[in-house]
Every structure is written in C-alpha cells, then in structure tokens.
C-alpha cells in the first residue's frame, strides 16, 4: 500500500479581517493510526493551532467529523480572523506512539493572507491659529490595513495638493500597517470656509476612498482692518465717530474707545455681519460731546482680536470751532453694521 500523503491543496488562502478562514487538508490513507495537528509556522518555534487529540481551541472548528473511523478530511475553520493570524499553516500527521505520538508527515503548507480595511483617516491641524500667507501643517493618519499598498492624496477645496510627505509603517513585513502624512498648506484671507481633505484608497474599499477632513476655520485667524471716520454733526455740540472693523475671523473681538488716551468705553463684538467669505464686519460708534473738551480730541479705536496684541486707529477731532461748555458728557453707542463687505 502507498505511503500516506498529507495534501494541502491550497497554496494560499485570502481572507478578510473578521471572516472565517478555511484551511483544507486531506490524508491519502488511514494508516498509520494517529492524530492530526495544525501549526502556524515551521521548526521549533511553530505555534499549535489545533490538536485533534486534546486541548481547547475556541476559534477552530473541524470541517468534518474527525471521530469517524474512516475520516481522511482534516480541514479546519478559524473564526474571526485578524491580520495577526497571517502566516503559513501546516497540517501535520502524527503516528501513535508511546509515551508520545511521533510526527509522521506534514503537508506542504497553506499561506494565509489577511486583508484588512484602513481606519477612517483622522486629520489634525496646528495647535495655534495662523494668519494668511503663513504655511501651516496638517497631519493625516490611518491604521490597521493590510496589505501594505495604499494611496493617500491631499486636497484643499477639491484641488489636489502636492506639498506633502507620507510614510507607511512598518517598512518591513507586518501583519498590518499604518500610514502617516503631513501636508503643508498656505493660508489665504479667503480660507475661512476652506476644507483640507485627506483621501485614502486601498484594495479592500468597495466605495470611494476614505476621507478625513479639517476645516480651516479652526486654523485660520484673519486680523481685522480698522477705519475710523467722523460722521456729520448729529446735534449741537455732538459728533458721531464710527470705527469700522472689517474682515476678521474668528468673531472673538473686544473694542475699546480712548479719548486722548483715556478709556472711554469697552465693548465686545456681538451683532456682527458675516461676509460671503466667512469673515465678519462690525461697527462701533462713539457720540462725543465736543463742548466738554477745551482742546482738540484724539479718538482711538483699539481692537483686541482673538487674544492677539491690540491694533488701533486714531482720529483727531477738532473742537476749537465749537462753543465751550462746563462739564463733561460723553455718550457711546454700538450698533451692528448693515452694510456688506465693501472690498
């Protein structure tokens, strides 16, 4: 009678993470008597996957009933496959012996490859806000995919970016991989509504590439432009001075009026108007009773935007032509501007 052969018909098996792998193995004879064992890897460091005789292998089930006397099918199923299960699996026939069974013959091995989807890309921007014309860095990360081949692209408002560096780790063989990419983006004043997108494509993805996004509204700071103007006289001895605060982002802004260097009023931007580009406009006015001043008045509109050093614009108010009165009466009002962006 011909000597027993262990047949593993599949040179390689490909399985998706989370699925079940079937590893096929048949013997050509019932003799010699003895159990089958499955190992991952070869040599002294091999890992026992299944032992027909003894042990507890919760993820492994046999395809056929190994207790039947004439059974020659020793195929197994391994459930809930992860990338860590990748490797070459050997079906090994043992001959019954005393005290221990003796390895008799091994199959040629089946290489199990696992395909795993990349995680959703996570895009993160700089910790601090930056102003237009500055270059900021964004990072994109995705993990857990296999095989290693992956493509990553960056977009800003649909336009592909070219200034980025990407690494896939580890460099050598691994059960699964991660990708890390850093893109450089130059900010413009119009970027409040802009988005940076990281797009990852992989063989496992049946849909479009996975996307991670970052809104530049969380990154950009557009400093305001100031304009102080004197309006026509409202009434005898009263002058209306306005401070137009234009094209700023984010909204966090505090305005202080100074009369000859002395704080007259401080207010926080509330009823702002939004421009099409996402920046804001705001207007504050100060009603000055010129009769309270003997000399010319230097009015200063001082703005502290988003915690940055204050910027200011001044206006000299001539009072010499007005009749002088005793006492001081300075009133200030604030209103939101109804006008749209004029730039």
């Amino acid at each position: 009678e011909e000597e027993l052969q262990v047949i593993q018909p599949d040179k390689s098996v490909l399985v998706a993470a989370g699925e079940t792998a079937t590893l096929r193995c048949t013997a050509t004879s019932l003799i010699p008597v003895g159990p089958i064992q499955w190992f991952r890897g070869a040599g002294p460091g091999r890992e026992l996957i299944y032992n027909q005789k003894e042990g507890h292998f919760p993820r492994v089930t046999t395809v056929s009933d190994l207790t039947k006397r004439n059974n020659m099918d020793f195929s197994i199923r391994i459930g809930n496959i992860t990338p860590a299960d990748a490797g070459t699996y050997y079906c090994v026939k043992f001959r019954k012996g005393s005290p221990d069974d003796v390895e008799f013959k091994s199959g040629a091995g089946t290489e199990l490859s696992v395909r795993a989807k990349p995680s959703a890309p996570v895009v993160s921007g700089p910790a601090a806000r930056a102003t237009p014309q500055h270059t900021v860095s964004f990072t994109c990360e995705s993990h857990g995919f296999s095989p290693r081949d992956i493509t990553l692209k960056w977009f800003k408002n649909g336009n592909e970016l070219s200034d980025f560096q990407t690494n896939v780790d580890p460099v050598g063989e691994s059960v699964s991989y991660s990708i890390h990419s850093t893109a450089k983006v130059v900010l413009t004043r119009e970027d409040v509504h802009s988005q940076v997108i990281c797009e990852v494509a992989h063989v496992t993805l049946q849909g479009d590439p996975l996307r991670g996004t970052a809104n530049l509204s969380e990154t950009i700071r557009v400093p305001p432009t100031l304009e102080v103007t004197q309006q026509p006289v409202r009434a005898e001895n009263q002058v209306n001075v306005t401070c137009q605060v234009r094209k700023f982002y984010p909204q966090r802004l505090q305005l202080t009026w100074l009369e000859n260097g002395n704080v007259s009023r401080t207010e926080t931007a509330s009823t702002v108007t939004e421009n099409k580009d996402g920046t804001y406009n705001w207007m504050s006015w100060l009603l000055v009773n010129v009769s309270a001043h003997r000399d010319d008045v230097k009015l200063t509109c001082q703005v502290e935007h988003d915690g940055q050093p204050a910027v200011s614009k001044s206006h000299d108010l001539k009072v010499s032509a007005h009749p002088k009165e005793q006492g001081s009466n300075t009133a200030a009002e604030n209103t939101g501007s109804n006008e749209r962006n004029i730039y």
């Epitope: 290489e111 395909r115 493509t151 494509a201 992989h202 063989v203 049946q206």
Partner: antibody, heavy 116, light 109 residues
Framework: VQLVESGGRLVQPGTPLTLSCTVS????????MGWFRQAPGKGLEYIGI?????SPYYASWVNGRFTISKTSTTMDLKMNSLRSEDTATYFC?????????????WGPGTLVTVSS | DIVMTQTPSSVEAAVGGTVTIKCQAG??????LAWYQQKPGQRPKLLIY???TLESGVPSRFKGSGSGTDYTLTISDLESADAATYYC???????????FGGGTEVVVK
C-alpha cells in the same frame, strides 16, 4: 448571485445606446461593479467601474464617450456616438468580496453591433 | 496605463500534460493579478486572484505564482475541458485601473 446585461443591438454609427446590467442576489450598494468589452475574436478590454457609493471611474481611452451610472438594482453604460470599432460583446462584472483587484462574477454579455 | 504582456498567444498540449502561461506587467503590480478562463461564446470565469489564491470551486490543478512584474499560470494534468482562452488581469493600486493581457489560447490534444 446573478448579473444579466441587456440593451445590445444593431445600431448605425453616430447613434447613442444605453446598456443595462441587472443584478440579483446582492446589493449594488455593497460592491464595485465594472463594464468590459470584447470585440469579435479579440481580448477583454476594461471600460470602467462604479463604486458602491456611485462614483464612476473610467479607463483612460474612454475620454468621456461612455458614462456609467446605477440605480438600486441596475448599472447602466451610456454610450454616445457609437463607432464601428465599438462593435463588441459587452460584459458587466462584480468585484470580489475581498477586494477590488479582481472580478469573480460576470454576466453572459450583450452584443452591440455598430454598422451602417 | 500599465501594459500586460501575455505569452504565448497560443499553446498546444496533450491530455495529462502541463501548460505554463506567463504574464508580464509594465511595472510592479504587487501581486494584484487575476487569471480568467474563457470558452468561446461564454463569459470569463475567475480562476485565481491575488497572484496565487485559488477561487472557490476551481481545481487545484490550476496554480498561480509570481510577484512584482512577472506572473505565471500553470495548468497540470490537463483535461480536454481545459481547452479555452486564458487571460491575466492586473489592478494597479496607485492608478486604481485595470488591464488585461492579450490572452493565451490553450489547445488540448
């Protein structure tokens, strides 16, 4: 799991034609689908795919002449201004469950003949 | 686009014999290669994917191997039912595009 192409017929050059691929046994929202063609006595040629989410991608030679779209149970190939060299059997196919690198289910094909 | 060069264009072998078909990609395709069998008037049938993985139900007489740019389909213990045209198909993970080889007609004597 089944794919069946329809719409193939004899048309004159310059005529538009739309082919359909009707699927059963699975959802088009779960798989990438592709269109291929085979001229008489020639090899297989890739036309384009549509992703599970409905985005089409085309072979570089297509140049806007063909459009792939889908509904819940059918995938269409709209062909503009057909030429005699478009005469072929057109196949639809589904990618495998493990990845988009191979096609494991094919339709029987539908014949398009472009001739005056 | 990647060009797939398949050789030979035709091969003849006897029943019980072995046939080897080669496919060379214009650049590395990282084992993203499938083999199909097509008989006259029929649809293509997937045999092997990811260079060496046998599709369910396909006899183990069909064996795929190779990596990088060079791939091989070996059919052993030829049967008359194996008479068909065989195509290789690549997928390029960067361009996300597909390409076919020109086909190999296998004649079984």
């Amino acid at each position: 799991v089944q794919l069946v192409e329809s719409g193939g017929r004899l048309v004159q050059p310059g005529t538009p034609l739309t082919l359909s691929c009707t699927v059963s046994g699975f959802s088009l929202s779960s798989y990438v689908m592709g269109w291929f063609r085979q001229a008489p006595g020639k090899g297989l040629e890739y036309i384009g795919i549509i992703s599970s989410s409905g985005s089409p991608y085309y072979a570089s030679w297509v140049n806007g002449r063909f459009t792939i779209s889908k509904t819940s149970t059918t995938m269409d190939l709209k062909m503009n201004s057909l030429r005699s060299e478009d005469t072929a059997t057109y196949f639809c196919a589904r990618v495998g469950p493990l990845g988009v690198d191979y096609f494991n289910i094919w339709g029987p094909g539908t014949l398009v003949t472009v001739s005056s | 686009d990647i060009v797939m060069t398949q050789t030979p264009s035709s091969v003849e072998a006897a029943v019980g014999g072995t046939v080897t078909i080669k496919c060379q990609a214009g650049q590395s395709i990282n084992s993203y290669l499938a083999w199909y069998q097509q008989k006259p008037g029929q649809r293509p049938k997937l045999l092997i994917y990811y260079a060496s993985t046998l599709e369910s139900g396909v006899p183990s007489r069909f064996k795929g191997s190779g990596s990088g740019t060079d791939y091989t389909l070996t059919i052993s213990d030829l049967e008359s039912a194996d008479a068909a045209t065989y195509y290789c198909q690549s997928w390029h993970y960067i361009s996300r595009s597909y390409a076919f080889g020109g086909g190999t007609e296998v004649v079984v004597k």
